[in-house]
């Protein structure tokens, strides 16, 4: 059969018609639609919307939509007996309180349930005590505290700005310090741009506003309860005590009109240098304790949220592909949200809306894809990535078979200046292809393409007159296929200067103020970015549902092992005397990178001069392609985190968000000098590369001459 | 295999002055804290001093501040103890130690300071 | 500073039997605690660290326990060669300090 035998169309012409049929007013509209009331994970209103996007995508043409429901831990205020922080005198009287909620917005003062500011999966407590102030509670901060300045945060309330790493890792890191509360707040200095009002009359985040979040340490472990098997009806849950990654200090973040009062009073070590200091007025002082005159004052955290067992709904749509209706190419972002969600996710939601809407259209024309499309709208990504890891972990046998790649499709912009763009090494070439044919939105580009903005804006740091393509870290739903499952994934947005905006993430992130007119007035009035988003994540799938061979390039894997196995020898190479001392050797490594480059070499030669009429050798040359992927897993998973298969690419263990490639090898050696047993912790580094070694060297015969 | 071997014990008078050396081979030496303890004749171990792998940041035992400073240079792989003031009470085998978040996990095998008159 | 109180200062005892040594901390050091063995005239020599972690080549005889304040040392068959001072150390807080020591002889 031809692949193109359901359509009477040109793959090229069917690309396009796909296009073409996205619309920005459609994305404009629907993001109003998914932001006017709140839609926290567990509520009605998600179940409500849950219900309302099935019947829309049933009504846009998808062959069958379904909720997929689990039951899952989560976390919320006590409605009777809110969160708050105070400053306590010698007597024990509360001489200062933080706010209990966000002043709402313009044209939400009458909206009901909006969650207060908290942070989920914090466990009840009213710790008192010294505060110690650890700049962003980083690894590196910890070190500089308790190395170099000799402070104990032992017993101690630490107060930690936001920004840089994954909250979860900053209250793991103070756990792990034997502080006994978290305080978590909002520096201007990294929510604030210079320039720009705060919101209402800008982008920016007022004093009052506050960002709320998880701060659990799942590790992919998906709900704390059920880690590796799906939270459904008959399935068995731990008890809270062996619950997966809960924290075990009360946390609880605050705006930065509330941490002034706190900060400003801050006496004991200055900030050991400028790196410690914000942008507010008060000294930065690390104490612990307040100063002389206030030095018998304390502060004490009253934390009252509870864990309770709740139900989520993802939407799992399909698009039954004509020719591979067993090859999964899944589209998915999530629903949930901290409360209107006009960024995150809705940004993102929008955009999936109008691309099953852009399919349903071509299909009801009489198109079908080559292959299967799944759309997915998750529930209680806001949680831990538990829709996703909860519906992969039921759906793992068929995923680990049949998924050929995981598109992500969380907030559509983060800012307004160029692309941004995570993914596998197999998809750059599809990347670069893609966004050569396609318009850049951005002012002085205009009749050039989005390939040439991106590149000039955000050139790639090693080849010349290429865009920046980042490794995938984590924070999102890709997690689980690609960490987990090993399904080839990869994300794009519209993102902000990173060399003029120093700020963490976007000011407003996970506040009230994360409104539909913060969209629609400050960030992207014509919607013209999130069209752009529309254009590259659904020609990312189109692509990849409808060529007849997979546009994934083997080679470009081959090059960025090379960097990495480079890079990690000389992380190694800090060590000379213990390399020798104790025989570390990579030239296993470099093998196997040498051996991969070659076989994927000739591998691409071979697909190229193949004969694409015979189904067989088609699908098998696909399968090698697909399979290559799945081919980096290492079913035990690294070190102390069996759900983190990937032996290439993981979450930093510093930095959810961040990726690190060669992870095994990179923790093994990680502040290596401070393990007191050198011979295990080098024959640690040495298994790290056998393990490393192998899986490329097994990874490149996947991809030899099947017989 | 890591070493350590301490060198420049000796008699020395009260009020006098003493520098001990240590030469470390086998591990990437500035990578390393490194530390002096002493045990004086039939007693029990005392720590004198630390410092950090890059020399930025030292500490010593309260019965040795102001008397003794601790340094190292990295380029020779060698670690000293400048001892000034000398007492009969410092009189001890000092032993160079390889520290590790404050363990001290590889030792030299010690210089006798005898203090006397 | 922190004090460190070890227990029994010596003990005698016979090839092959089960030996304990105690040490208690003036205030808890959590995990941080470290055993050393010094045979005379000899450097010490680490054993174990962080309470309870068997330092790479020390034989499986010797186990530590305990946390906050009170930790103990266990030979579980003693040898010939176990015949020696042993000394407990705090590395939770500077200035680290040491026990007194427990001298093992033989009976």
């Known amino acids: 059969k031809s692949s193109n035998e359901a359509t009477n169309i040109t793959p090229k012409h069917n690309m396009k018609a796909f296009l073409d049929e996205l619309k920005a007013e459609n994305i404009k509209k629907f993001l109003y639609n998914f932001t006017q009331i709140p839609h926290l994970a567990g509520t009605e209103q998600n179940f409500q919307l849950a219900k309302q996007i099935q019947s829309q995508w049933k009504e846009f043409g998808l062959d069958s939509v379904e909720l997929a429901h689990y039951d899952v831990l989560l976390s919320y205020p006590n409605k009777t007996h809110p969160n708050y922080i105070s400053i306590i005198n010698e007597d024990g009287n509360e001489i200062f309180n933080t706010s209990l909620f966000e002043p709402p917005p313009p044209g939400y003062e009458n909206v009901s349930d909006i969650v207060p500011p908290f942070s989920a999966f914090s466990p009840q407590g009213m710790p008192e005590g010294d505060l110690v102030y650890v700049n962003y509670a980083r690894t590196e901060d910890f070190f500089k505290l308790e190395r170099d300045m000799k402070i104990n945060c032992s017993g101690k309330i630490v107060i930690a700005r936001y920004g840089k790493v994954f909250r979860g890792n900053k209250v793991k890191n103070a756990q792990l310090a034997g502080a006994k509360g978290v305080i978590l707040y909002s520096d201007p200095a990294d929510y604030f741009a210079p320039g720009v009002k705060s919101y209402p009359d800008g982008w920016n985040l007022p004093g009052g506003g506050v960002q709320r979040g998880n701060i659990l340490n799942l590790n992919g472990a998906g709900d704390p309860l059920t880690p590796g098997y799906p939270a459904n009806e008959y399935a068995y849950r731990r008890g809270i005590a062996e619950a997966v990654g809960l924290p075990s200090i009360p946390v609880h973040p605050i705006g930065y009109y509330d941490a002034q009062k706190l900060l400003e009073k801050m006496g004991g070590s200055a900030p050991p240098d400028s790196s410690w200091r914000g942008s507010l007025k008060v000294p930065y002082n690390v104490g612990p304790g307040f100063t002389g005159n206030f030095s018998t004052q304390k502060v004490k955290m009253h934390i009252h949220s509870t864990n309770e067992v709740t139900r989520i709904y993802n939407v799992i749509g399909t698009l039954r592909g004509a020719v591979e209706p067993d090859r999964y190419v899944i589209l998915g972002g999530h629903r949930d949200s901290w409360v209107f969600g006009g960024i995150d996710p809705q940004s993102g939601a929008a955009v999936v809306h109008e691309i099953v809407r852009s399919f349903g259209t071509l299909k009801k024309e009489g198109w079908r894809p080559r292959r299967t499309i799944l759309f997915a709208s998750w529930d209680a990504e806001e949680f831990g990535l538990l829709g996703s890891t909860e519906w992969a972990e039921e759906n793992s046998r068929l995923l680990q078979e049949r998924g050929v790649a995981y598109i992500n499709a969380d907030s559509s912009i983060e800012g307004n200046y160029t692309l941004r763009v995570d993914c596998t090494p197999l998809m750059y070439s599809l990347v670069h292809n893609l966004t050569k044919e396609l318009k850049s939105p951005d002012e002085g580009f205009e009749g050039k393409s989005l390939y040439e903005s991106w590149t000039k804006k955000s050139p790639s740091p090693e080849f010349s007159g290429m865009p920046r393509i980042s490794k995938l870290g984590s924070g999102n739903d890709f997690e689980v296929f690609f960490q987990r499952l090993g399904i080839a994934s990869g994300r794009a947005r519209y993102t902000k200067n990173w060399e003029t905006n120093k700020f963490s993430g976007y000011p407003l992130y996970h506040s009230v103020y994360e409104t539909y007119e913060l969209v629609e007035k400050f960030y992207d009035p014509m919607f013209k970015y999130h069209l752009t988003v529309a254009q590259v994540r659904g020609g990312m799938v189109f692509e990849l549902a409808n060529s007849i061979v997979l546009p994934f390039d083997c080679r470009d894997y081959a090059v960025v092992l090379r960097k990495y196995a480079d890079k990690i020898y000389s992380i190694s190479m800090k060590h000379p005397q213990e390399m020798k001392t104790y025989s570390v050797s990579f030239d296993s490594l470099f093998s196997a990178v040498k051996n991969f480059t070659e076989i994927a070499s000739k591998f691409s030669e071979r697909l190229q001069d193949f004969d694409k009429s015979n189904p067989i050798v088609l699908r098998m040359m696909n399968d090698q392609l697909m399979f290559l992927e799945r081919a980096f897993i290492d079913p035990l998973g690294l070190p102390d985190r069996p759900f983190y298969r990937h032996v290439i690419y993981a979450p930093s263990s510093h930095n959810k968000y961040a990726g690190e490639s060669f992870p095994g090898i990179y923790d093994a050696l990680f502040d290596i000098e401070s393990k007191v047993d050198p011979s295990k912790a080098w024959g640690e580094v040495k298994r790290q590369i056998y393990v490393a070694a192998f899986t490329v060297q097994a990874a490149a015969e996947t991809l030899s001459e099947v017989a | 295999e890591v070493q350590l071997l301490e060198s420049g014990g000796g008699l020395v008078q009260p009020g006098g002055s003493l520098r001990l050396s240590c030469a470390a081979s086998?591990?990437?030496?500035?990578?390393?804290?490194m530390g002096w303890v002493r045990q004086a004749p039939g007693k029990g171990l005392e720590w004198v001093s630390t410092?950090?792998?890059?020399?930025?940041?030292?500490s010593y035992a309260d019965s040795v501040k102001g008397r003794f400073t601790i340094s190292r240079d990295n380029s020779k792989n060698t670690l000293y103890l400048q001892m000034n003031s000398l007492r009969a009470e410092d009189t001890a085998v000092y032993y160079c130690?390889?520290?590790?978040?404050?363990?001290?996990?590889?030792w030299g095998q010690g210089t006798l300071v005898t203090v006397s008159s | 500073d922190i004090q460190m109180t070890q227990s029994p200062s010596s003990l005698s005892a016979s090839v092959g039997d089960r030996v304990t040594i105690t040490c208690r901390a003036s205030?808890?050091?959590?995990?941080?605690l470290n055993w050393y063995q010094q045979k005379p005239g000899k450097a010490p020599k680490l054993l174990i660290y962080?309470?309870?972690t068997l330092q790479t080549g020390v034989p499986s005889r010797f186990s530590g326990s305990g946390s906050g304040t009170d930790f103990t040392l266990t030979i579980s068959s003693l040898q010939p060669e176990d015949f020696a001072t042993y000394y407990c150390?705090?590395?939770?807080?500077?200035?680290?300090?040491f026990g007194g020591g427990t001298k093992v002889e033989i009976k």
């Open positions: 130690a390889r520290v590790i978040r404050q363990v001290a996990t590889t």
């Open positions: 086998g591990f990437t030496f500035g990578n390393y804290a």
């Open positions: 410092i950090s792998g890059s020399g930025g940041s030292t």
């Open positions: 205030q808890s050091i959590t995990s941080y």
């Open positions: 962080d309470a309870s």
């Open positions: 150390q705090q590395s939770y807080i500077t200035p680290v300090t």
